[in-house]
């Protein structure tokens, strides 16, 4: 700030002092600040301490606070779907039907036309439309990973309902390590949580695109609604304009 | 806004406007709008109406944005902590120890002593103290719910480590439900997450507190740094304040 | 919260979410977005009185403190607090797009 | 981001976080608080300038209306972004308490 | 810095055939658009037609006095812009010139032209 | 088609004059309306785009107005280098439709 704005400086730079003095003494709802008359002397006791940085130090797994959006957020966002390969694909005999689990795979051909950088990438939903469910159901979803193993994504606690909902898992770290590899067909997994010592595992839950025997015309509108991948990215071209003036002001 | 304000208020309104109009065609990079020339006549496609609404509709599991703070976070929260309830207590006999589940129990005496009433906390995180790690291990949080069943709280993926680290998992819903019921002990539960197919459900992280034939000096470090619970409530004197000025602005 | 639900249905003269409903062919003169017609894009209006000075009577500064200047600003501002994305549906020649365009609704407003 | 990485190291002179570290004793005069003794609080300043005018060169004004005017104010304001929280220590009477307080310190800023 | 730079244009019979060349340099060609418009001697500017971007699927339209007779077509990989013309009349005798266009319903750059002159 | 008529035709005027050119569209074009300069033996030039907007690179001395069916193109100061022919375009429907051309001229 050029040099007849030093006062200035200094005039807010007094004005926030003192506005902290309010802010701290407000925030503790106190009028004035507390007698020191009592305090013991000495250190402060070691419990104290050790409370005082258990607050301070921040944790894994504790949420800090939300960081502030990239300058790439603030553009709008192009969004696309990529509906799940239909259920008669060969891919899906690979994978036994089993009772606690239904298999979902993506063409990944069609992810690249829609995103054809994997940085161009901003989010990534799962979505799924559930229909009516009697019980309370806990379920997790997965990735395929490699041949035959799965990787575990997030869960979700699913409450019992009498009309169809939909649901969203934000999938945008797998589909962008997709968008990086090679593969044709890349493929999520829903199950039921199992504990451990629990033997209950059916997933009871009914998704929509996976239920056979409909009639016709029924079909098509399940087709429709069958899980898809709502895709938000940022236009090719708006990216590369982007990439030109980030180190502009 | 007073009358002699309006002419304020529709200027101010003019100028929003004529921002809006900048920040739409800014955010799109467009340096003027598209022109119609070539839109197809008639109504918009099946398909893309159909992509509008999902992106329209916010569905269940998506984040919505942040809620903003409510006046209550405004004013200070006192710190408390809370530990676990030590492994030779006879509570820990009634679960017999296996090999993908810790157990983790607080007299909630202890914790309606820090927080006297339920809706003064405003977070509670349950804090363990992994030791070192040699592979990665998904475990799972669960509360003690009923008789002899555990209700999932929430999981966490635990990379290999070569030091101690402290974990957080935010309770704040859990303990506010211990202030309000009357028992004397509740519980967590740390288990191995356990897959349907799986069957390698031993839990390989060391917590410490946990670890038994200590010399008798390093116990104690160890019992320090056992699983607690940090508190942040409003102090109840402040919270009287706050009510009774709830209604005031 | 200074929110829809608070600011729309009272006379505050403070800082507030204030009404305000864009309809792009009329006030825009914009024909381009095919959906939607228009938003509640509203917007943040109302002073925040500096309240701390060393001579005020400080137990009435406290009780306004957090409202008019939480952020102990040396200039406090009335200004979004939460925002919400806005959908659109607009074409590029002959080809049809949807794009989200992120923080374009104010919901509630802060003095900050 | 217009946060303490950019702004403490650049001369900017628009909307920036600027560096203030709070000294309890010497700029407060308080002995009360007894852990931290001070801490960095930093503040916002710079103009946000209104660049939206239907005549100016529509290039240019794209270029920088995500910096200066994201949310589309009528009078944007330099305000905060990203904030923490400072835990304190300090004694009622004979007893020791560890408090929280919220939203102490500026780490970034925003045109709003 | 964008550059169109039209060639192909001479003297052709009636009812004769030639095509004309537009090399572009300075920007991502799959990008954009790309035009031609005419303008006769000592008369105004007339748009022919255009050939869309990638994302339009690279697909032309013209204007009604070109259609059927005039073709535009686009080389990526040479960064160039065609113009077939066929069955010419001497009302085509003009200055050929291959312009940018934008969305917004504009043409940003301009070539410097090509004359074509149809006489018997 | 739409139809675009300029006036007037040609116009002669000092430097350091201001001048105003007209176009006339046969309907309602939404502020489509574009601008070129045409000077002899050089390329055609866009000015203003989108019925105000300046190109980039072009002198502010050059701004455009109007709305519906009505526009204007000003030259707050006249300069020996205006001499030229301009063109106005409407971009709202196709085809793509210019006016017949203004030539401008140095008294």
């Known amino acids: 700030l050029s040099t007849c704005k030093t006062i200035d400086m200094e005039l807010v730079k007094r004005k926030r002092i003192e506005a902290i003095r309010g802010q701290i003494l407000s925030k503790l709802r106190l009028a004035s600040p507390p007698s020191q008359g009592e305090v013991p002397p000495g250190p402060l006791p070691e419990a104290v301490l050790a409370l005082y940085n258990s607050t301070r130090d921040r944790v894994a797994g504790e949420s800090a606070e939300p960081e502030p959006e990239p300058e790439a957020d603030y553009y709008a966002k192009e969004v696309t779907r990529v509906l799940m390969v239909e259920t008669h694909n060969e891919i899906y005999d690979k994978f036994k039907q089993s009772t606690h689990s239904i298999y979902m795979f993506f063409n990944t051909s069609e992810l690249r036309e829609a995103v054809p950088e994997p940085v161009l990438l901003s989010r990534a939903e799962l979505r799924l439309l559930r229909l009516k469910l009697k019980v309370e159901q806990h379920v997790e979803l997965y990735q395929k990973y490699s041949n035959n193993s799965w990787r575990y994504l997030s869960n979700r606690l699913l409450a019992p309902s009498d009309s169809p909902e939909w649901l969203s898992f934000d999938v945008t770290g797998v589909v962008r390590q997709w968008l990086s590899r090679g593969g044709e067909i890349e493929g999520f997994r829903l199950s039921a949580h199992c504990s451990c010592d629990s033997r209950d595992n059916t997933l009871q839950v009914d998704i929509n695109g996976f239920t056979t025997g409909r009639r016709g015309d029924l079909a098509t509108i399940h087709g429709m609604n069958r899980p898809f991948l709502l895709l938000m990215a940022t236009p090719l071209e708006r990216a590369q304009h982007l990439q030109s003036s980030r180190h502009r002001r | 806004l007073s009358t002699c304000k309006t002419i304020d208020m529709e200027l101010v309104k003019r100028k929003r406007i004529e921002a809006i109009r900048g920040q739409i065609l800014s955010k799109l990079r467009l340096a003027s709008p598209p022109s119609q020339g070539e839109v197809p006549p008639g109504p918009l496609p099946e398909a893309v109406l159909a992509l509008y609404n999902s992106t329209r509709d916010r569905v269940a599991g998506e984040s919505a944005e942040p809620e903003p703070e409510p006046e209550a976070d405004y004013y200070a929260k006192e710190v408390t902590r809370v530990l676990m309830v030590e492994t030779h207590n006879e509570i820990y006999d009634k679960f017999k120890q296996s090999t993908h589940s810790i157990y983790m129990f607080f007299n909630t005496s202890e914790l309606r002593e820090a927080v006297p009433e339920p809706v003064l906390l405003s977070r509670a995180e349950l804090r363990l103290l992994r030791l070192k790690l040699k592979v990665e291990q998904h475990v799972e949080l669960y509360q003690k719910y009923s008789n002899n069943s555990w209700r999932y709280l929430s999981n966490r993926l635990l990379a290999p480590s070569d030091s101690p680290e402290w974990l957080s998992f935010d309770v704040t819903g859990v303990v506010r439900q211990w202030l309000s019921r009357g028992g004397e002990i509740e519980g967590f539960r740390l288990s191995a997450h356990c897959s349907c197919d799986s069957r390698d459900n031993t839990l390989q992280v060391d917590i410490n507190g946990f670890t038994t034939g200590r010399r008798g000096d390093l116990a104690t470090i160890h019992g320090m740094n056992r699983p607690f619970l940090l508190l942040m409530a409003t102090p109840l004197e402040r919270a009287q304040h706050l009510q009774s000025s709830r209604h005031r602005r | 919260a200074l929110d829809t639900n608070y600011c729309f249905s009272s006379t505050e003269k403070n800082c507030c979410v204030r009404q305000l409903y864009i309809d792009f062919r009329k006030d825009l003169g914009w024909k381009w977005i095919h959906e939607p017609k228009g938003y509640h894009a509203n917007f943040c209006l109302g002073p925040c009185p500096y309240i701390w000075s060393l001579d005020t009577q400080y137990s009435k500064v406290l009780a306004l403190y957090n409202q008019h200047n939480p952020g102990a600003s040396a200039a406090p501002c009335c200004v979004p607090q939460a925002l919400e994305p806005l959908p659109i549906v607009y074409y590029v020649g002959r080809k049809p797009k949807v794009e989200q365009l992120s923080n374009m609704i104010v919901r509630s407003c802060k003095c900050s | 981001a217009l946060d303490t990485n950019y702004c403490f190291s650049s001369t900017e002179k628009n909307c920036c976080v600027r560096q203030l570290y709070i000294d309890f004793r010497k700029d407060l005069g308080w002995k009360w608080i007894h852990e931290p003794k001070g801490y960095h609080a930093n503040f916002c300043l710079g103009p946000c300038p209104y660049i939206w005018s239907l005549d100016t060169q529509y290039s240019k004004v794209l270029a920088l209306y995500n910096q200066h005017n994201p949310g589309a104010s009528a009078a944007p304001c330099c305000v905060p972004q990203a904030l923490e929280p400072l835990p304190i220590v300090y004694y009622v009477g004979r007893k020791p308490k560890v408090e929280q307080l919220s939203n102490m310190i500026v780490r970034s800023c925003k045109c709003s | 810095e964008v550059q169109l730079v039209e060639s192909g244009g001479g003297l052709v019979q009636p009812g004769g055939s030639l095509r004309l060349s537009c090399a572009a340099s300075?920007?991502?060609?799959?990008?954009?658009?790309m035009s031609w418009v005419r303008q006769a001697p000592g008369k105004g500017l007339e748009w022919l037609g255009f050939?869309?971007?990638?994302?339009?699927?690279?697909?032309?339209e013209y204007s009604a006095s070109v259609k059927g007779r005039f073709t535009i077509s686009r080389d990526n990989s040479q960064n160039s812009l065609y113009l077939q013309m066929n069955s010419l009349k001497t009302e085509d005798t003009a200055v050929y010139y291959c312009?940018?266009?934008?969305?917004?319903?504009?043409?940003?750059?301009w070539g410097q032209g090509t004359l074509l002159t149809v006489s018997s | 088609d739409i139809q675009m008529t300029q006036s007037p035709s040609s116009l002669s005027a000092s430097v350091g004059d201001r001048l105003t050119i007209s176009c006339r569209a046969s309907?309602?074009?939404?502020?489509?309306l574009n601008w070129y300069q045409q000077k002899p033996g050089k390329v055609v030039k866009l000015l203003i785009y989108?019925?105000?907007r300046l190109h980039s690179g072009v002198p502010s001395r050059f701004s455009g107005s109007g709305s519906g069916t009505d526009y204007t193109l000003t030259i707050s100061s006249l300069q020996p280098e205006d001499v030229a022919t301009y063109f106005c375009?409407?971009?709202?429907?196709?085809?793509?439709?210019f006016g017949q051309g203004t030539k401008l001229e140095i008294k």
């Open positions: 312009a940018r266009y934008t969305g917004g319903g504009y043409f940003d750059y």
């Open positions: 300075g920007f991502t060609f799959t990008d954009y658009y």
């Open positions: 050939i869309r971007n990638k994302p339009n699927g690279y697909t032309t």
């Open positions: 309907q309602d074009i939404s502020n489509y």
């Open positions: 989108y019925t105000s």
């Open positions: 375009q409407q971009g709202d429907t196709l085809p793509w439709t």
